[in-house]
């Protein structure tokens, strides 16, 4: 039975040209995390594997950095980066947990972070 929950940074906004940290937090489970995938819609951004470390997708290689922790830092934001991002936690023995973050990249200088929320 999957008892865990994923908390994410929720709905967030950032300025064009700036950077943003995407973070998810898995809690309420003793399952071992073996890999975390970060995806934008259907496109893979990065993989963090417990044995092999990080792999950043070539199309994001110049502006994505690992961390903090299992999170991801996305730099040099463009309006095209607006959209849904998913953290996919592969765990044993529970299986897969998925968290969703919506990022809006704004042209203006006013970009406020949304509140945190939980995805069971």
């Amino acid at each position: 039975m999957m008892t865990g929950t994923i908390e994410t940074t929720g709905n967030i906004s950032a300025e064009k040209g700036g950077s943003i940290i995407l973070q998810c937090h898995l809690s309420s489970t003793t399952a071992q995390v073996t890999q975390v995938n970060w995806e934008q819609q259907d496109q893979l951004l990065a993989i963090c594997n417990a044995d092999l470390g990080w792999h950043i997708s070539p199309s994001f290689k110049d502006r994505v950095a690992p961390g903090p922790g299992l999170g991801l830092t996305l730099q040099s934001l463009t309006v095209n980066d607006t959209g849904e991002y998913f953290c996919i936690y592969h765990t044993y023995p529970d299986g897969t947990y998925t968290g969703r973050i919506f990022l809006e990249v704004l042209e203006s200088s006013v970009a406020e972070h949304g509140a945190r929320f939980q995805i069971p």
């Epitope: 003793t30 995390v33 470390g53 990080w54 961390g67 903090p68 299992l70």
Partner: antibody, heavy 116, light 107 residues
Framework: QAYLQQSGAELVRSGASVKMSCKAS????????MHWVKQTPGQGLEWIGC????????NYNQKFKGKATLTADTSSSTAYMQISSLTSEDSAVYFC?????????WGQGTLVTVSA | DIVMTQSQKFMSTSVGDRVSVTCKAS??????VAWYQQKPGQSPKTLIY???YRYSGVPDRFTGSGSGTDFTLTISNVQSEDLAEYFC?????????FGGGTKLEIK
């Protein structure tokens, strides 16, 4: 088996710069961030910053911006840290540490002593 | 910056005992906490990551627990080789920060 070999102890004059190295072996250098940590008896452990060798993106502790510069050479699997305008406060042991999201592996440390 | 407080600078224990080292974060760091062991003249070694997961090769007498702001490293059946200083660290947000350390003394 991952291994980090740090360069030897340095005795440097106040006002000068020092560049230390951290040579990685036993793993894919570009798949892990390299962090740098300062240790002194007075201040304990302080995180200086990190570099991801896959694209050389860096992240610095604001306290060490302008003081430390992190670089990486993927051809030799070596990370470097330069510390500039040295003062007695920079006398410390400096560690490099590999981080891949699932725990950290530390180098043996480089002792830097700043003399007047 | 997030402050990690290890209120006990020294702890005294005997071989075979169980001891708990505590660490408190100034704000919620979820489970993004690691514990390190450092013996005199050596570099730190990772014991625990993600608050409760044992790092490769670490004996199972070392156990981590906690989430949010309160974290504990428990050493059961203390051995003489556990004489060392223990540090917590948060890696939830930059800059990463460390606790001041707790020195374990063996009676």
């Amino acid at each position: 088996q991952a291994y980090l070999q740090q360069s030897g102890a340095e005795l440097v004059r106040s006002g000068a710069s020092v560049k230390m190295s951290c040579k990685a072996s036993g793993y894919t250098f570009t798949s892990y961030s390299m962090h740098w940590v300062k240790q002194t008896p007075g201040q304990g452990l302080e995180w200086i910053g990190c570099i991801y060798p896959g694209n050389v993106i860096t992240n610095y502790n604001q306290k060490f911006k302008g003081k430390a510069t992190l670089t990486a050479d993927t051809s030799s699997s070596t990370a470097y840290m330069q510390i500039s305008s040295l003062t007695s406060e920079d006398s410390a042991v400096y560690f490099c540490a590999r981080d891949g999201g699932f725990g950290t592996y530390w180098g043996q440390g480089t002792l830097v002593t700043v003399s007047a | 910056d997030i402050v990690m407080t290890q209120s006990q600078k020294f702890m005294s224990t005997s071989v075979g005992d169980r001891v708990s080292v505590t660490c408190k974060a100034s704000q919620n760091v979820h489970t993004n906490v690691a514990w390190y062991q450092q013996k005199p003249g050596q570099s730190p070694k990772t014991l625990i990551y993600s608050a409760s997961y044992r790092y490769s090769g670490v004996p199972d007498r070392f156990t981590g627990s906690g989430s949010g702001t309160d974290f504990t490293l428990t050493i059961s059946n203390v051995q003489s080789e556990d004489l060392a200083e223990y540090f917590c660290q948060q890696y939830n947000s930059y800059p990463y920060t460390f606790g001041g350390g707790t020195k374990l003394e063996i009676k």
